[in-house]
């Protein structure tokens, strides 16, 4: 267990031209506040995916009124740190989103209004217990300067806050194999005792007495390889006879989600869908109102009409969920017709149409043959969103403009020689073969495998292919 701490140093116009307008004015005074969202790993997760490591909201900053004509200065900031407690191990690598919000304090009906000024995101490596790391991030014309660190809560220590420290039993030294707990030299590292029998290779523990499995292993002691090929259930200890998985304890068993949250399993853990008014990894954060800025992704917060609708987020296009935390996969509805490629640009959908189709949803089938002539007597044939020409004999190519070489495909069998002819091709057959393509052998007794040769042609004469 531990705490991620974020200190905002400044928020103001970035360097370079195009300084942003002040977000506040004499007519509309405002104040800033910040929201941080943390996720484990270096994932390229979208802004709306759950803040699995936790989230925090700052206090409101001092009220600020723009001085007319003055450029936007660094804006006054809220006091104090943003603190995100984490219950489990610190992952070492994490992704963050820091949002700067403006609270307008004008005389609006319905109370103050919130709007998102800037959002910065990044992926970092950070060991718990280390010094403050400084960072500068830009969002449009704005610049945010901040520092962050992760620190363990006693008795946890170490870069992941998984080692435990205990006061020394002997004044001079620690027990066998146990080191002093830097920086608490008067304490000793406590052995982390996992559940008895927990596999040292495939299991680990973050709390004494537990046994958590690495991916690919299961069972109470993490000794059973996961093999679901012939099984129905996706988890649990192996059946001794089949090697199949049978249902065992899953991450949602016992429902870790508090306050009526519903649990769904994810490949590595679980995810809580929280009722309105609660959020956090386990729906443990409660008493949320619009003052807490619960609507993500620029959602507009309004107070609800009863205790179960304490606040309501009106989501911008492309987002949904009670906190606007889910991106709508609008392409999953397959809005592009006729094989068009769907692109969700966030603010809008675009369809990239296949040849021969047009329109916002590729719904218009272009008249493929309109204005397209096929040369040399060819006829245009529509089909599949593309035109093609059915060419007259002796011509080929997309528009029948190329004179076809009928001999290019070597149509004469058994060594026959091909001659181009104005109406097609002629095969001169090798001795012992006959037919339009020299495909029939002449029988040894002089009789043909065909009916008698047409009058005027002896076997072996060139046969013209019509």
């Amino acid at each position: 267990a531990g705490v991620f701490e974020l200190q905002i140093h400044s928020f103001g116009p970035g360097p370079g031209p195009g300084a942003p307008r002040s977000p506040c004015s004499a007519r509309l005074p405002c104040r800033l506040f910040f929201r941080v969202c943390l996720k484990p790993g270096l994932s390229e997760e979208a802004a709306e995916s759950p803040c699995a490591l936790g989230a925090a909201l700052s206090a409101r900053g001092p009220v600020y009124t723009e001085q007319p004509g003055a450029p936007a200065p660094d804006l006054p900031l809220p006091d104090g740190l943003l603190q995100v407690p984490f219950r489990d191990a610190w992952p070492g690598t994490f992704s963050f989103i820091i949002e700067t919000w403006r609270e307008e304090l004008g005389d609006q009906i319905g109370g103050p209004a919130w709007s998102l000024l800037a959002r910065v995101a990044g992926r970092r490596r950070l060991a718990a217990g280390g010094p403050w790391a400084r960072d500068i991030q830009r969002a449009g014309a704005w610049e945010l300067r901040f520092s962050y660190r992760a620190r363990c809560e006693p008795p946890a220590v170490g870069t992941a806050c998984t080692r435990l420290c205990r006061p020394r039993s002997a004044p001079s030294r620690c027990g066998p194999g146990l080191r002093p707990c830097a920086p608490l030299e008067d304490e000793c590292e406590a052995p982390l005792v996992c559940r008895a029998g927990c596999s040292p290779e495939h299991g680990f523990c973050e709390q004494p007495g537990e046994c958590r499995c690495l991916e690919g292993w299961t069972g109470p002691l993490c000794t059973v390889p996961v093999s679901t090929s012939s099984c129905l259930s996706p988890r649990g200890p192996s059946s001794a006879t089949t090697g199949c998985l049978v249902p065992g304890p899953g991450p949602c068993d016992g429902n870790p989600c508090a306050n009526g949250g519903s649990c769904s399993e994810t490949p590595r853990s679980f995810e809580c869908t929280c009722p309105r008014g609660f959020y956090g990894l386990r729906c443990e954060v409660s008493g949320v109102t619009c003052a807490d800025g619960p609507c993500f992704n620029g959602g507009l917060c309004v107070g609800g009409a009863d205790p179960d609708s304490a606040y309501i987020c009106h989501c911008p296009p492309g987002f949904q969920g009670s906190n606007c935390e889910k991106r709508v996969d609008r392409c999953s509805l397959q809005p592009c017709r006729n094989g068009g490629l769907c692109l969700d640009l966030g603010h809008a959908l675009r369809c990239r149409c296949r040849a021969g189709f047009a329109g916002p949803r590729c719904e218009h089938d272009l008249d493929d043959c309109a204005g397209r002539a096929c040369a040399n007597g060819g006829t245009c044939v529509e089909g599949g969103g593309a035109h093609r020409c059915s060419c007259a004999l002796g011509f080929g190519g997309r528009d029948c403009r190329e004179r076809a070489d009928p001999c290019a495909a070597r149509p004469c069998a058994h060594g026959g020689r091909c001659y181009a002819h104005f109406s097609g091709l002629v095969c001169a057959c090798a001795p012992g073969y006959m037919g339009a393509r020299c495909e029939f052998p002449v029988h040894p007794d002089g009789a043909s495998a065909l009916p008698a040769a047409p009058p005027g042609l002896r076997p072996g004469d060139p046969q013209r292919y019509l």
């Epitope: 009722p275 609708s309 309501i312």
Partner: antibody, heavy 117, light 109 residues
Framework: EVQLVETGGGLVQPKGSLKLSCAVS????????MNWVRQAPGKGLEWVAR??????????YYADSVKDRFTISRDDSQSMLYLQMNNLKIEDTAMYYC????????WGQGTLVTVSA | QAVVTQESALTTSPGETVTLTCRSS?????????ANWIQEKPDHLFTGLIG???NRAPGVPARFSGSLIGDKAALTITGAQTEDEAIYFC?????????FGGGTKLTVL
């Protein structure tokens, strides 16, 4: 547009029973708490009962005047709200409304319950 | 059990501004009471006007606004119209129990 349609009202004798239904459409019924409100002839509004959603374990709440006589329930799969009324009294005569609160109040058109000897 | 009190009747003229209030016997009304305002017109025609103290329902004219004034919830009609003549109920939530006021009969002469 959100629609709440109440049915099941009628004339019943004192100590009798009646079950009201409310069919809900055009919103995600499962997400929200639902309520019954009534208005006796010539009187004001009185809240009767409330049922929360599945996330809140379908917790129920009642006005003191109907406690132990009325039971509110819901069927999320059918988007239906119910009010089972037992041991009815003459003072239960009223127009009964299915009501849900979100950003503001949504009302049905009501169903009339008359308790008379 | 909380008691919610409203003015029994108010009279205003077209174009005037009128404020209806809603008092709680348990103390000051706060946003945690999620004050709601409902309009009743003849033939049991109920319309939700305001929810959650401030939120005006879609289709409700902008002349209707909800707020907290002192220790009471308030419904203000800025520039009353003759069609605003109706009975107005306020409802306050106390945890999971809802209590309505007795209603204010508004006359627009």
């Amino acid at each position: 547009e959100v629609q709440l349609v109440e049915t099941g009202g009628g004339l019943v004798q004192p100590k009798g029973s009646l079950k009201l239904s409310c069919a809900v459409s055009a919103f995600t019924f499962t997400t929200y708490a639902m309520n019954w409100v009534r208005q006796a002839p010539g009187k004001g509004l009185e809240w009767v009962a409330r049922i929360r959603n599945k996330s809140n374990n379908y917790a129920t709440y009642y006005a003191d005047s109907v406690k132990d006589r009325f039971t509110i329930s819901r069927d999320d799969s059918q988007s239906m709200l119910y009010l089972q009324m037992n041991n009815l009294k003459i003072e239960d005569t009223a127009m009964y409304y299915c009501v849900f609160y979100y950003d503001y109040v949504y009302w049905g058109q009501g169903t009339l319950v008359t308790v008379s000897a | 059990q909380a008691v919610v009190t409203q003015e029994s009747a108010l009279t205003t003229s077209p174009g005037e501004t009128v404020t209806l209030t809603c008092r709680s016997s348990t103390g000051a009304v706060t946003t945690s009471n999620y004050a709601n305002w409902i309009q009743e017109k003849p033939d049991h025609l109920f319309t939700g006007l305001i929810g959650g103290t401030h939120n005006r329902a879609p289709g409700v004219p902008a002349r209707f606004s909800g707020s907290l004034i002192g220790d009471k919830a308030a419904l203000t009609i800025t520039g009353a119209q003759t069609e605003d003549e109706a009975i107005y109920f306020c409802g306050l939530w106390y945890s999971n129990h809802l209590v309505f006021g007795g209603g204010t009969k508004l006359t627009v002469l």
